[in-house]
Interface confidence: low
């Protein structure tokens, strides 16, 4: 008997309270199913009942939680029904309170380098699930180290290539409810840095400004970059600006940072929008120094 | 349906150890805690600990730890309870419970029979 | 550890009565919590689990309520068949607890 194939869109794993639609393909081209669930809480919506073509679950509760396999009909079989399909593992989240999710050292991971992923708790978390945005496939499934103040896991994750590069966030469980998920981490973005050659940077009106003085950066590069991002050294997240095409036949970004009071390393990168998560080697670091100012970073 | 079928009563003096074992059927015995708790005569229910028998992992109440021992035998979908250097305090009823009431789920959905474990000189 | 006060440890009730149980806990357990009933030489049967979900083939005259601290078991007509020792027991963390237990005898 052929097995049909069952899906979850827009994926397996769901917050509690969402939708999800469960896809189940015959490849003889049968669109009628049944549903049903193997594990967890039962659910009634599912009994004794045929779907067409698909079926829109929700809104989820832990309830909903656990293994679901389709039958499709097939006029063929002395039921009625093929075998059963493939399992689907439905996830729901926001049971638990969210962990944090760290990268070290830190999340600009140079091509073919390694990162650690560290997700933990002061929840006693035996499970953590890695997810990357907009993968369909289940999440990465890791055993936390539980400790006094609570648990954590660290992942390897390299050598890193743009495939691996993404937008993650982690999510914990304990064993007794394995399908029922903390709210998920804040996302934490992996970016592979060095995939294309890098960009200019440099200061208007100049490095070395006085206090409260405006300054501007500007990165440029005649590679077609869509996007140009700043970073300051020691500090998290970065400016990001669409690049213009100049007279020059460069394509070049301004950022304007304003009075400045404090100064400090910065580096640009460029990327494409096709790419977000890719970007060029950094720029050479430009000092910017202030003046009039005790403080010199 | 889910069974779980304790090991006989058991007589032990002060120091000893003792191995009580839950046998399992009825489900997929890899997919769920089997947790020991235990009760004394006349007294309230305490929470031994339990092992996670698709990985063997296991989380012990701090109360026993390092007298405790408590493993699984996929082959024979039976967990094993080993409580050593016994005192007379130890004199209880030993149930496993298996987690989940739907599922691997929530806290104790079935229970074993009980094996009363007796400590005396 | 978290502990669990229960209360009354002990009352006695007539068949009809509406009997409450409530159980307290030392910090927030969510709704981590079941209900338990014990008859003599048996093994506990479990009644109520994430606080006030009734497990199958249990009588709805058993009710369970609460969140956070404060849960209460009630049994809306006792029945011949009622009468046991009831426990609650917390599995919001490690190490899990049960209350000391609520005995319910006849009048």
């Known amino acids: 008997q052929d097995k049909p194939f069952l899906s979850a869109w827009p994926g397996t794993v769901v917050s509690e309270g969402q939708h999800v639609t469960l896809q189940c393909r015959s490849r003889l081209g049968f669109n009628e199913f049944s549903l049903s669930k193997e594990d967890g809480m039962p659910v009634p919506e599912l009994y004794n009942r045929i779907f067409r073509n698909s079926f829109l679950m929700g809104p989820v509760t832990p309830a909903h939680a656990g293994t679901y396999r389709c039958c499709s009909s097939h006029p063929h079989s002395p039921t009625g029904w093929s075998a059963p399909s493939n399992p689907v593992v439905i996830m729901v989240t926001g049971v638990h309170r969210k962990p944090s999710l760290l990268a070290h050292p830190g999340p600009l991971v140079k091509s073919g380098e390694t990162v650690i992923l560290q997700c933990w708790s002061d929840v006693r978390f035996e499970r953590f699930l890695l997810h990357r945005e907009g993968i369909t496939e289940d999440p990465l499934r890791l055993v936390g180290q539980l400790h006094d103040a609570g648990s954590q896991v660290n992942y390897s994750m390299g050598p890193m290539t743009p495939a691996l590069a993404g937008t993650y966030r982690c999510f914990g469980s304990v064993t007794h409810l394995p399908y029922e998920l903390s709210a998920p981490s804040d996302p934490l973005d992996i970016v592979v840095v060095g995939l294309y050659g890098k960009p200019s940077l440099s200061a208007q009106p100049g490095p070395t400004v006085q206090a409260g003085e405006n300054v501007t950066l500007s990165c440029s590069s005649r590679s077609l970059f869509d996007i140009y991002h700043l970073s300051r050294e020691a500090e998290a997240g970065e400016l990001r600006l669409t690049a213009v095409l100049r007279v020059n036949g460069t394509f070049q970004a301004n950022f304007p940072l304003g009075p400045v009071t404090h100064g400090g390393n910065y580096r640009c990168f460029g990327s494409f929008r096709a790419l977000p998560h890719a970007w060029s080697d950094p720029s050479d670091p430009l000092p910017v120094s202030v003046t009039g100012n005790s403080r010199h970073l | 349906q889910v069974q779980l079928v304790q090991s006989g009563a058991e007589v032990k003096k002060p120091g000893a150890s003792v191995k009580v074992s839950c046998k399992a059927s009825g489900y997929t015995f890899t997919s769920y805690n089997m947790h020991w708790v235990r009760q004394a005569p006349g007294q309230g229910l305490e929470w031994m600990g339990y092992i996670f028998p698709g990985d063997a992992g296991t989380n012990y109440n701090q109360k026993f730890k390092g007298r405790v021992t408590m493993t699984a035998d996929t082959s024979t979908s039976t967990v094993y309870m080993e409580l050593s250097s016994l005192r007379s305090e130890d004199t209880a009823v030993y149930y496993c419970?298996?987690?989940?009431?739907?599922?691997?789920?929530?806290?104790?959905?079935?229970w074993g029979q009980g094996t009363l474990v007796t400590v005396s000189s | 550890d978290i502990q669990m006060t229960q209360s009354p440890s002990s009352l006695s009730a007539s068949v009809g009565d509406r009997v409450t149980i409530t159980c307290k806990a030392s910090?927030?357990?969510?709704?981590?919590l079941s209900w338990f009933q014990q008859k003599p030489g048996k093994a506990p049967k479990t009644l109520i689990y994430r606080a006030n979900r009734l497990v199958d083939g249990v009588p709805s005259r058993f009710s369970g309520s609460g969140s956070g601290t404060d849960f209460t078991l009630t049994i809306s007509s006792l029945q011949p068949e009622d009468f046991a020792t009831y426990y609650c027991?917390?599995?919001?963390?490690?190490?899990?607890?049960f209350g000391g237990g609520t005995k319910v005898e006849i009048k």
């Open positions: 910090q927030d357990i969510q709704s981590y």
């Open positions: 027991l917390h599995y919001a963390e490690f190490p899990y607890t």
């Open positions: 419970a298996r987690s989940g009431y739907y599922g691997n789920y929530e806290g104790f959905a079935y």
